[in-house]
């Protein structure tokens, strides 16, 4: 009878020990299994979860525009006054709804190449007005012409055309014209076959971005989605030195197992450069724990504040000998047009940049860019890309429309907020397939370990108690 009880207690302790050991073993084994599964599923090749979402994003992406409507155009042109602007928006378009095209796997170097078609569909229900709403904005062609043709003889010729076409420093254009293009009356007078269509994003619809060639991760998962080349080149040919490098991914995903200490590098063709994001905070996105990575102010700093940025300062006059910050001259990438990129409302820009403009209200929460990355898979499940398009306009003695200007202005034209968030259905699926399974496995591991340890300890205590009782 005593033996039966003792045997039973020992059996219970052994079972507990086995469960505890199994739970303990399951931890590294389970992690290994998860890692193996993740590594398999994030590879960019036919049949994987990542590939399906990569070819055509499951997220609805919107691009909202706010246009800076100039309130005092005549005063600026005549007296070189401060430019008073009032933002109007949002005007919302659906973008990135087209699947990647010309997808070609290269098994030799473990890459996949593709182009990303561009398209934009206006969403009236998410907009404050229609595409026919009018705005007073800088005359893009008039501002750009003397910058492209700094030759004084040609400026005299251009002045004749500007006067003949009755163009001036500012113009009134509809949203549709401003964004997607309009036939410019001044350029239409140039008696040579040049492109006479002007628009902030012209040409956009029916164009493609790329060719991109990215690592598929088959041989090395830590390189998955990292851009190997863009438009057939490993460099951009826009910037001197290392600033010209194409670093990281396209920000839609990153190699898996993202750590908070990691700097996420990515290339954005919109700003013609590679940039980076650093860990900001942990947030819960529809029940999925994600890391919010933010673009630091340091990325837009002057070379004085951040010496790494010295090669992004390509001209000395407007940048006050590279002391100004918060604006990026991307003219080299825009056929020599005087295009400057910044954060909305000149957030994180030096006071000299925003001083000639009235009506700007930079706000960290509304105007910063962030990426919400699920750390296990490296997928970006939510993002907000915010940037502002500005045009430099300078005094030009030979051009009457610009001859009264006493200083250069970096004139804000519009800012955009491109956002995407994983849908509820997709989030549920993601939780079931990824975070849910990981949570469940973690719970099983802890339960086995916990129950095993409790059983072992309880049965061992009972056994010892029984033994000492019998001994007496």
């Amino acid at each position: 009878m005593g033996c039966d009880r003792n045997c039973g207690l020992i059996a219970g302790a052994v079972i507990g020990a086995v469960l505890a050991v199994f739970g303990g073993i399951l931890m590294p084994v389970g992690d290994m299994l998860i890692e193996k599964t993740i590594k398999r599923e994030v590879v960019l090749e036919e049949g994987t979860t990542a590939f399906k979402n990569w070819v055509k994003t499951g997220t609805t992406v919107y691009r909202q525009f706010w246009i800076f409507d100039v309130q005092n155009p005549d005063d600026v042109a005549k007296n070189s006054s401060k430019i008073k602007v009032k933002q109007r928006g949002p005007y919302t378009y659906r973008v990135r709804y087209l699947a990647k095209e010309n997808i070609t796997q290269d098994p030799e170097d473990h890459t996949v190449s593709f182009v990303q078609p561009n398209g934009a569909i206006f969403e009236p229900s998410l907009s404050v007005g229609t595409e026919d709403d009018n705005f007073t904005v800088l005359n893009l062609a008039v501002a750009a012409a003397p910058h492209i043709y700094q030759n004084s003889f040609v400026q005299v010729v251009l002045n004749s055309l500007i006067k003949k076409s009755k163009s001036s420093m500012f113009q009134t254009r509809s949203l549709k014209e401003l964004l997607w293009g309009y036939k410019d009356p001044f350029l239409s007078l140039v008696p040579y076959p040049i492109s006479t269509t002007v628009g902030v994003f012209y040409p956009y619809n029916d164009t493609v971005d790329g060719v991109y060639k990215v690592f598929n991760g088959k041989d090395n998962i830590s390189k998955v989605a990292i851009i190997e080349s863009y438009k057939g080149k490993r460099n951009l040919s826009y910037w001197p030195s290392y600033c010209d490098m194409i670093n990281g991914t396209d920000a839609a995903s990153f190699p898996p197992f993202v750590e908070k200490s990691r700097t996420l590098r990515f290339f954005s063709s919109d700003i013609c450069r590679s940039i980076y994001a650093v860990f900001g905070s942990e947030i819960d996105l529809k029940g999925i724990p994600v890391y919010r990575f933010v673009l630091p102010a340091n990325a837009f700093a002057s070379p004085l504040q951040n010496p790494d940025n010295h090669c992004f300062c390509t001209e000395k006059v407007i940048s006050n000998n590279c002391t100004s910050y918060g604006v990026l001259d991307i003219g080299k990438c825009k056929e020599g047009k005087p295009v400057y990129i910044s954060l909305p409302h000149f957030l994180h820009a030096s006071p000299d940049v925003s001083e000639p403009i009235e009506g700007l209200h930079p706000n960290e929460d509304e105007h910063r860019t962030y990426l919400d990355v699920e750390p296990i898979t490296g997928f970006t499940l939510q993002f907000a890309k915010r940037l502002q398009v500005n045009i430099l306009v300078k005094p030009a003695r030979k051009i009457e429309a610009l001859k009264n200007l006493k200083r250069p202005y970096i004139v804000p034209i519009l800012w955009l907020n491109e956002t995407g968030t994983i849908g509820d259905e997709k989030a549920e699926m993601f939780k079931t397939q990824v975070t849910g399974k990981i949570k469940l496995l973690g719970m099983v591991e802890m339960a086995l370990l916990g129950i095993g340890v409790v059983m072992f300890v309880a049965f061992m205590i009972s056994y010892c108690a029984c033994k000492s009782k019998n001994g007496k």
């Epitope: 003889f153 005299v156 010729v157 002045n159 004749s160 007078l189 140039v190």
Partner: antibody, heavy 117, light 107 residues
């Protein structure tokens, strides 16, 4: 086909006047603007005057300023150079030429102006 | 005014020779330089604009180079029809100015 044909040259006494014409075909002179360039016998080329596109401003070499006037009749697609107070040093072959960006892609055959007593 | 100084003022060469004519601007004219060929009794003909851009119909043996203040016209292999006077011209600032010319003669 683009063509420029000058006329109106000849012998004139010092202090006299002459009006040169430049008839254009194959393009619209108002879109481009027209220049007059001269070449004294055995010498190099000298830019004389220019009328900017669309009846824009007129520009002259210092040596002819106040004496020469450039004009255009868009209905006739013809440019003119009115030369007053002519001097011996104005003796030259006068060419009209088309230009937009400042280089001359088409030239006329030239017309000789001789200023002599 | 911008002065354009051409050198040499004349040169003798044989058919098949490589000929180089230089032109110096008195101030920076970027790439706004044109080159012309003129034969006796004829109007000049445009060869090159924007310092390096070959005008349509001009044989590829003609080439231009340079930027800023120093410019060069090169004829890679001189042909019988190339014996003429060559002029450079800046089209950066009014008044437009020409070099004094370089006469290429048969050796």
């Amino acid at each position: 086909e683009v063509q420029l044909v000058e006329s109106g040259g000849g012998l004139v006494q010092p202090g006299g006047s002459l009006r040169l014409s430049c008839a254009a075909s194959g393009f619209t002179i108002s879109s481009f603007g027209i220049h007059w360039v001269r070449q004294a016998p055995g010498k190099g080329l000298e830019w004389v005057a220019w009328i900017a596109p669309y009846g824009g401003d007129e520009y002259y070499a210092d040596s002819v300023k106040g004496r020469f006037t450039i004009s255009a009749d868009t209905s006739k697609n013809t440019a003119y150079l009115q030369m007053n107070s002519l001097r011996a040093e104005d003796t030259a072959v006068y060419y009209c030429a088309r230009s937009f960006f400042g280089y001359f892609d088409y030239w006329g055959q030239g017309t000789l102006v001789t200023v002599s007593s | 005014d911008i002065q354009m100084t051409q050198s040499p003022s004349s040169l003798s060469a044989s058919v098949g020779d490589r000929v180089t004519i230089t032109c110096r601007a008195s101030q920076d004219v970027s790439n706004w330089v044109a080159w012309y060929q003129q034969k006796p009794g004829k109007a000049p003909k445009l060869l090159i604009s924007y310092a390096t851009s070959l005008y349509s119909g001009v044989p590829s043996r003609f080439s231009g180079s340079g930027s800023g203040t120093d410019f060069t016209l090169t004829i890679s292999s001189l042909q019988p029809e190339d014996f003429a006077t060559y002029y450079c011209q800046q089209h950066s600032n009014a008044p437009l100015t020409f070099g004094q010319g370089t006469k290429v003669e048969i050796k």
